[in-house]
Interface confidence: medium
């Protein structure tokens, strides 16, 4: 069963946000961080196939403005009562008998149920408040240290303008039950009979505290000589205006593709992917496009030697088992984006980083770009998925899941529509069912799965994670063996 919290958020947003303007919160852990007036950065996506993530920077708008004063009050919207229940049951039985001979009978039932009842309300900043706020206050001088760091990385900064929050503490429960029975009798001189039955029940409960943010909306900050707030962010607009000129690195430092100073590795990655093609039209938004993007990225890896691949894989396996190491590696590579030397790290993150830098501490773009892309994909996935990828890496069983995920992405086109696909037994090996690695990998992407006749119900919102899962499997697989 996938994340119960995410499922609830998905249902609430589907119901209350028809304009698609709200950004769903992806984990309960981060749900308290998104409050009106809070500043967030949009972590650029390493691919066109999954969405950027928003991350709190633990600052409020008042922290970057002077004179210092509390933020203006927010408006509380009316409450919505949200009730979502799901109850499904499948059962079947079979009996085989020949007159006066053996009898075999069996039955099975699977049921799934969940119910959620909650009150949700909105908190928003009145659009007119921004005008007043910016008229009465101006950017603090000297600039806040965090803003300086974000400026040097070229990150875009946003302010939360509206949130959807829970009114009371809510308990969300999902139950999954399986039952099976069988009996047989063999008539003869001595009659032999037997029967057996069993059941398995799985229950997942999550408590969402009162005041948890389920989804939020943002406006973009533009910082030039003073601050401006764009309530309708423009894709081309940047928070910090880039410096007029950027120096190029000398080739001996390994500058391919060359990175102008102040440009992030992520933007360099996009230039590398599009190779001069306008960003939107770089790859078609379907499985062929995703595969082409992944192949473009992994092309460089095919030339790397065995020793380096081994070092990289060992480090990546460690990073997949350690969320803190994953974050540390991401931060270190972000630091290297602005072309400064990268600080060495300990543990598995350090092992990966060591492969990506020259003796000067500068990143080698040919190596850093595929790893930044891979980390971008990995950050879309859950901790459970990371652990399963580490296990598949260790046991060299990446190809099976790669083919399965690829096949589903290909079959599910167009991704914007719900559909049901049956799974070819050849792709499942001998393990399918709750708890099987392939099942968990897909379940964690937010797909509805069927066990008795293996099938998958495609959910449009699973696209980002599924594409990221495919990219992660493909790159790890490419590093660990000969490309197919």
């Amino acid at each position: 069963m996938g994340s119960a919290f995410e499922r609830v958020v998905r249902r609430v947003v589907q119901e209350l946000d028809h304009g698609g303007e709200f950004i769903p919160v992806t984990s309960l852990q981060s749900s308290t961080g998104f409050q009106p007036y809070c500043l967030v950065v949009r972590k650029p996506s390493s691919s066109w196939f999954w969405k950027p993530r928003y991350k709190c920077v633990n600052l409020s708008i008042k922290d970057i403005l002077e004179p210092d004063a509390a933020e203006p009050d927010v408006q509380r919207g009316r409450s919505f009562h949200f009730y979502d229940a799901m109850d499904g049951q499948i059962q079947g039985s079979v009996e085989l008998a020949a007159p006066g001979q053996a009898k075999i009978a069996g039955g099975a039932a699977v049921s799934d149920s969940s119910s959620t009842s909650m009150n949700v309300y909105s908190l928003s900043v009145d659009p007119n408040t921004w005008q007043t706020l910016l008229h009465e206050r101006h950017l603090r001088q000297p600039e806040h240290k965090v803003l300086q760091q974000l400026r040097s990385r070229g990150d875009n900064v946003y302010v939360v303008t509206e949130v959807l929050q829970t009114q009371k503490e809510v308990e969300v429960t999902r139950t999954h039950k399986r039952e099976g029975s069988g009996r047989f009798s063999l008539p003869g001189a001595t009659c032999l009979q037997g029967e057996g039955q069993g059941h398995l029940s799985q229950k997942k409960t999550v408590t969402i505290p009162s005041g948890s943010t389920l989804a939020f909306r943002v406006a973009q900050l533009v910082i030039d000589s003073d601050l401006d707030v764009l309530l309708f962010p423009d894709k081309k607009q940047r928070t910090f205006q880039p410096p007029a000129t950027g120096h190029k690195r000398s080739t001996s430092e390994g500058a391919w593709p060359q990175l102008p100073s102040g440009l992030s590795m992520m933007r360099c990655l996009h230039n590398f992917l599009t190779d001069g093609v306008p960003a939107e039209g770089a790859f078609t938004e379907d499985f062929q496009g995703l595969r082409a993007e992944v192949e473009t990225i992994s092309k460089e890896l095919e030339l790397l030697d065995r020793e380096l691949c081994q070092l990289l894989l060992e480090g990546l396996e460690g990073v997949l088992r350690d969320q803190l190491a994953l974050r540390a590696l991401e931060e270190a590579l972000e630091q290297g984006q602005s072309l400064g030397p990268v600080e060495p790290l300990d543990g598995p993150a350090g092992a990966v980083l060591e492969c990506l830098v020259l003796s000067s501490g500068m990143l080698v773009p040919e190596l850093a770009i595929p790893v930044v892309y891979l980390l971008g994909a990995l950050t879309m996935l859950s901790e459970t998925q990371h652990k399963l990828l580490a296990e598949a890496l260790e046991s060299q069983t990446l190809l099976g899941p790669l083919e399965l995920v690829g096949s589903l992405l290909e079959q599910s086109a167009p991704w914007q529509e719900r559909s049901t696909m049956s799974l070819p037994p050849g792709l499942l090996g001998n393990s399918w069912g709750e708890g099987a690695p392939a099942w968990v990998l897909l379940d964690e992407c937010g797909l509805e799965l069927g066990e008795d006749t293996p099938h998958v119900c495609w959910e449009p919102q699973a696209q980002g994670r599924m594409c990221a899962l495919y990219a992660s499997l493909a790159l790890l697989s490419g590093l660990s063996q000969e490309p197919h």
Epitope: R306, L308, P365, E482
Partner: nanobody
């Protein structure tokens, strides 16, 4: 713009020496295994020697050049060299350098197979004649 440029070729008498250089621009040479290949008129391209990236310590040579040729690299200069001593007329060919991959096998000869290479230079002519 990824480029490999070979220099140092020329006309030399049998028994003489030449030092070929392969300079890389637009990418970081030291993360790649590098190889030297040659193609004589009317013959197929063949592997001469290769050297592993900074992550390894291996050097391989074709039997025909063992003991006479030495491959080396200077990562700071983004350059790979081929020192050729005791040259013979059968060494006459256009010499190319290229990035090579032998990560998928422990067979030492695989790096000398042109098909596993990636980036290629435009070549430099070596003529051994009296």
């Amino acid at each position: 713009q990824v480029q490999l440029v070979e220099t140092g070729g020329g006309l030399v008498q049998p028994g003489g020496s030449l030092r070929l250089s392969c300079a890389a621009s637009g990418f970081t040479l030291d993360i790649y295994n590098m190889g030297w290949f040659r193609q004589a008129p009317g013959k197929e391209r063949e592997g001469v020697s290769c050297i592993s990236s900074r992550y390894g310590t291996s050097t391989y040579y074709a039997d025909s050049v063992k003991g006479r040729f030495t491959i080396s690299r200077d990562n700071a200069k983004n350059t790979v060299y081929l020192q050729m001593n005791n040259l013979k007329p059968e060494d006459t060919a256009v010499y190319y350098c290229a990035t090579v991959s032998w990560r998928f096998t422990t067979n030492q000869d695989v790096c000398l197979t042109p098909s596993v290479s990636g980036y290629w230079g435009q070549g430099t002519q070596v003529t051994v004649s009296s």
